[in-house]
């Protein structure tokens, strides 16, 4: 008994395709060894036709493939454009020779079945409409017209010109003539179902003078397309159901025993298991749409189907497309935190992994929104301006070569809670989903800046201090000036570093930054933060207002800006931080349903890239004490 298993008999007809799945025992050796498909000769020799090593025989060129699914312990042989010459005995097997583990498969390819003369073959997918054409002679122009379906020797009427319709074809079948045509009538059958398949006879007239035509209707089930994805990666289901359902609600469902449970539809329904990691994006006016799911889990593996119906639910006799999704647990995508917790007024540093081979790719961070079909507007990117409402509190630090970038969001409020996506314009599999949970703060923040009323005077010296607790003693402290393309590190002076860690005085741990002399362009947001190497930690932000010595010109009260930092980050308090409209990154949230479009994301944005290890920002006059 062979441990390899597969179909013993496969039968099809000329011109068709077959997809033969062979199952092997789940061992590491089996997963990685050569897989083959060979044809058994009369001499006992089995000639390789295709193998996983890349071999492809001449007779299979351009019409066959072999795909290994190690996670599923299967491999699939696809053979298209079958001919009767393909009939024979085959083996699917494993091993370096064709004598290893194998399973015998018999393939029989028949001629296209012979039908009565003048039989027209109609091949349609489930849910589609067929139009059967029935020709007749002039003598039967005024006679009764009908279409019947052969059941054994009998032929049961489906529809006729006396307005009779078989109950199982009610509202689906119509008989009509086109224009002035006097020699053809037509029968439309819509919302095709598998049991509609069979031989039909259309007839005009009665008795021996009747005109008859034969029609063979094949109704094809959707053959699931196999999708093989890594754990924690993303998958896009591209659904093209045709123009006839362009105006109907669309859905993606997952097959579950007797039902197909809707995961998302265009009427606003969404499965909670996919909250924060799914987007449905219309592609065009012809009914095409795509569904993107990120953060794939083991339990996401299974059969999926997309369809269209006014109810937004699966309905028999409506067009569908099918997929089988495999989720490979041997993933190249690192396991990162799926939930990040923060407190109001505090900050979070979110590490976003990306394909290390694509360090020059553009990085983005977007906020998943549940409204309608889900969308993910970009908040920040390496070439995208920070979105309004996030100025001064959001920055992206790229760490080239490390395979990760960090997004820091500070001045947190409970409204920041929700799902965020890390994505790049490169490898589309590397899209990760993070849930941010912001709770009300119960204690003072770890980092505190003085003075809180930060107003600097042009030409003078201005020093600002950041107090940190002893737990941050060994970490690197920094000040940076926030701008639209990141937060650029400034020279600063750590006054606590001179003490030994044993005698850490909680009150005297200070890192300070001095502006000397103060310039007008020094106005803006400054961050005090801690980090260890490339790992960013807590940050706090303060707005530094800059005034003329004369104090003649009106200026916004700086305390308002820093009140915003502590209480209401979502309010826009600063006139000076509002940019001109043309500088705003106008990023289409739909970009992220399809990697082909994401590269447009930075088109309107500025060219300079954020950098976490930059020196002092341009025009900055920071100095050490």
């Amino acid at each position: 008994q062979s441990p390899i298993f597969g179909p013993q008999d496969v039968s099809s007809i000329e011109g068709n395709s077959v997809s033969i799945t062979c199952y092997y025992p789940d061992t590491s050796v089996n997963r990685h060894t050569r897989k083959y498909w060979c044809r058994q000769g009369a001499n006992g020799y089995c000639a390789t036709l295709i193998s996983s090593n890349g071999y492809l025989s001449k007779e299979y060129s351009g019409r066959a493939s072999l795909i290994n699914f190690p996670e599923n312990s299967t491999f699939v042989i696809n053979i298209a454009h079958l001919t009767q010459e393909d009939t024979g005995s085959y083996k699917c097997g494993l091993g370096t020779t064709n004598r290893g583990l194998f399973f015998d498969v018999s393939l029989e390819v028949s001629q296209v079945p012979e039908f009565p003369n003048d039989t027209h073959v109609y091949t349609k997918d489930i849910g589609r409409t067929v139009t059967i054409e029935c020709r007749f002679k002039e003598g039967n122009a005024h006679s009764k017209k009908s279409l019947c379906k052969k059941r054994g020797e009998a032929c049961e009427v489906v529809i006729d010109s006396t307005e009779y319709v078989d109950p199982s074809y009610k509202d689906r079948a119509i008989l009509f003539m086109k224009g002035t045509s006097r020699d053809i009538f037509y029968v439309n059958i819509s919302h095709l179902i598998p049991s509609d398949a069979g031989l039909y006879v259309c007839q005009a007239g009665e008795g021996p003078s009747a005109d008859k035509n034969n029609a063979d209707l094949q109704v094809l089930e959707p053959e699931p397309e196999l999708l093989y994805k890594d754990l924690r990666s993303s998958v896009t289901f591209e659904c093209d159901l045709g123009r006839e359902v362009a105006n109907d609600a669309k859905y993606l469902c997952r097959k579950n025993k007797e039902t197909c449970d809707v995961i998302i539809n265009t009427l606003g329904k969404r499965d909670p298991a996919f909250e924060g990691r799914i987007l449905l994006t219309p592609r065009d006016d012809n009914g095409r749409f795509s569904v993107l799911i990120t953060g794939l889990r083991k339990e996401d593996a299974g059969h999926y189907q997309c369809g269209a119906h006014s109810s937004g639910l699966p309905q028999e006799g409506w067009p569908v497309q099918a997929w089988q999704l495999f989720v490979n647990e041997e993933s190249t995508i690192p396991n990162s935190r799926s939930v990040v917790k923060g407190v109001t007024g505090g900050s979070v540093a979110i590490v976003c992994p990306y394909n290390p081979k694509e360090s020059s790719s553009l990085k983005y961070w977007c906020h998943w929104e549940a409204d309608e079909n889900g969308r993910c507007p970009v908040l920040v990117g390496t070439q995208a301006l920070v979105q309004e409402g996030y100025e001064g509190r959001l920055a992206l630090f790229d760490q080239p070569g490390s395979g990760a970038y960090t997004v820091i969001l500070n001045q947190l409020t409970t409204q920041d809670s929700g799902f965020y996506w890390c994505l790049t314009d490169g490898d589309s599999r590397w899209r990760t989903t993070i849930e941010l949970q912001v709770a009300e703060a119960t204690k003072k923040p770890d980092l505190e800046v003085t003075p809180q009323n930060a107003t600097a005077v042009i030409g003078e010296t201005f020093t600002i201090s950041c107090h940190y607790p002893c737990k941050f003693y060994s970490q690197e402290k920094y000040w940076c000036k926030w701008s639209n393309d990141g937060c650029h590190i400034l020279p600063s002076h750590d006054e606590g570093a001179r003490q030994s860690s044993v005698s850490c005085d909680q009150s005297s741990q200070i890192v300070s930054m001095t502006l000397n002399p103060v310039k007008k362009e020094d106005e803006g947001w400054y961050w005090c933060g801690v980090k260890e190497g490339q790992v960013y930690g807590e940050t706090t932000a303060i707005y530094v207002a800059v005034e003329e010595r004369t104090r003649g010109s009106p200026h916004i009260n700086p305390t308002d800006a820093n009140a915003r930092a502590k209480d209401a980050p979502e309010e826009e308090a600063m006139e000076s931080s509002v940019r001109e409209d043309e500088n705003k990154a106008n990023l289409d949230p739909r970009l992220f349903a399809d990697e082909r479009e994401i590269q447009n994301a930075g088109d309107q944005a500025q060219e300079n890239r954020a950098s976490g290890n930059a020196g002092s920002a341009g025009g900055q006059s920071g100095s050490s004490k």
Partner: nanobody, 129 residues
Framework: EVQLVESGGGLVQTGGSLRLSCAAS????????MGWFRQAPGKEPERDFV?????????????YYADSVKGRFTISRDNAKNTVYLQMNTLKPEDTAVYYC?????????????????WGQGTQVTVSS
Amino acid sequence: EVQLVESGGGLVQTGGSLRLSCAASGRTFSSYAMGWFRQAPGKEPERDFVAALRWSNDRTYYKYYADSVKGRFTISRDNAKNTVYLQMNTLKPEDTAVYYCAGGNYFSDPRVDKEYNYWGQGTQVTVSS
């Protein structure tokens, strides 16, 4: 909802033949994977794979058999009647069991009973020696 009804079981002598039928009714049957499983006496709740049939359209069929029935049992389908058959020849006493018909939209592995969506009530086959 789809109902599957098995028939054709009975008592037969060793070496004899039986033909089991599985008729699908209810909601139009659009399943395109059908299988036969059996449960030997005292083996509850274990159901062993016997044979399966998958079709990707009306013209392409894949037939799967357990090693123990290869060459003796044949699975087939009549699309017009929404019926699947299991022709059992050269029956042996160890073939005695309740035979269940199962239907599914697809299966990842035809031998796994969990892959099937619909089940019949079963029909008893007894092979006497």
